[in-house]
């Protein structure tokens, strides 16, 4: 399906005129990642994908924006506030915290291009950094000193 029919410069527009601004301010995910305290979901499976076998298990939540490439990004959401016991796979160990691991991913936003005298000349791609949570990791709690 072609959703971006005029994505990129209009006919006759030099590609060097494309707007490729670099933004160093990461865009945050849609909502803060709060651990899910639903007891059934807070467990490490014996099989299945990495995110469900981890002792800091997580799920993925879709973040879709049709004016962005890639349009679909997935944010990890921790299922437990603490780490899960390796022995039982279900009991939480308060000595470890389950925390999100972030990555600043390069994305491109579609923006209207403006030619001379403010005329609309197709679409341009604007490069941005976008903060994505990749996974949850089991970490030792910070000691506030």
């Amino acid at each position: 399906y072609s959703h971006w029919p005029s994505c990129c410069p209009s006919k006759g527009q030099d590609t060097s005129e494309e707007l490729l601004r670099w933004s160093t301010v990461p865009v945050p995910p849609l909502e803060p990642a709060r651990p899910n305290r639903h007891p059934e979901s807070c467990r490490a499976s014996e099989d299945g994908p990495l995110n469900s076998r981890a002792i800091s298990p997580w799920r993925y939540e879709l973040d879709r924006d049709l004016n962005r490439l890639p349009q679909d990004l997935y944010h990890a959401r921790c299922l437990c506030p603490h780490c899960v016991s390796l022995q039982t796979g279900s009991h939480m160990d308060p000595r470890g915290n389950s925390e999100l691991l972030y990555h600043n991913q390069t994305v491109f936003y579609r923006r209207p291009c403006h030619g001379e005298k403010g005329t609309h000349k197709g679409y341009c791609l604007e490069r941005r950094l976008y903060r994505v949570s990749l996974a949850c990791v089991c970490v030792r709690p910070r000691v506030m000193g």
Epitope: Y1, R59, E61
Partner: antibody, heavy 122, light 107 residues
């Protein structure tokens, strides 16, 4: 030929939970997102949510958070929707629908299951 | 959430007629609009995606148009098998939302 075969009609008691299945065939299951849609009184269509079978990633309509849970079983190419704490308001026909795309530009439900009728009654 | 409105809930037409079904969005949806057909037995099929693109296998008598907030589906030469309910759906923003449906009947 793309086919989505849903489980049969269900009559369930208020307060109970139930799971509807949607078995996909005729395409690579993990390559396409699966949507779920509710139709009440044979009229209004309401989008419940979607799941990406590749990574289990989901997006829910806020109105169905806590009501519906979407999962997949990749080994059997089957998508599931569990409905929790059922009430008479949940009596409806539920559809699974594959989300078609061309590689990276998505978003039309191009194939639908036949629907599963759920009646909640004591 | 984006509200989708199909003001005509039912429509009567004769075979061979040209029929237009309209749909409006509560805000601009940049042509991110699909049309679906639901038959009396509950079967749902995609007709049109991205406002005007015909889904594979759909007869060419179906066409779609529109922009901004206003969209329409046109059946140029009504056939008996077109008797169904038609729904528009936006996918500009999650959650996806549908119009209330327009039921097409034969005069």
């Amino acid at each position: 030929e793309v086919q989505l075969q849903q489980s049969g009609p269900e009559l369930v008691k208020p307060g109970a939970s139930m799971k509807i299945s949607c078995k996909a065939s005729g395409y690579s299951f993990t390559d396409y997102t699966m949507n779920w849609v509710k139709q009440s009184h044979g009229k209004n269509l309401e989008w419940i949510g979607l799941i990406n079978p590749y990574n289990g990633g989901t997006s829910y309509n806020q109105n169905f958070k806590g009501k519906a849970t979407l999962t997949v079983d990749k080994s059997s190419s089957t998508a599931y929707m569990e409905l929790l704490s059922l009430t008479s308001e949940d009596s409806a026909v539920y559809y699974c629908a594959r989300e078609g795309y061309d590689g990276y530009l998505y978003f039309a439900m191009d194939y639908w299951g036949q629907g599963t009728s759920v009646t909640v009654s004591s | 959430d984006i509200q989708m409105t199909q003001t005509t809930s039912s429509l009567s037409a004769s075979l061979g007629d040209r029929v237009t079904i309209s749909c409006s969005a509560s805000q601009g949806i940049s042509n991110y609009l699909n049309w679906y057909q639901q038959k009396a037995d509950g079967t749902v099929e995609l007709l049109i995606y991205y406002t005007s693109s015909l889904h594979s296998g759909v007869p060419s008598r179906f066409s779609g148009s529109g922009s901004g907030t206003d969209y329409s589906l046109t059946i140029s030469n009504l056939e008996p098998e077109d008797i169904a309910t038609y729904y528009c759906q936006q996918y500009s923003k999650l959650p996806y939302t549908f119009g209330g449906g327009t039921k097409l009947e034969i005069k």
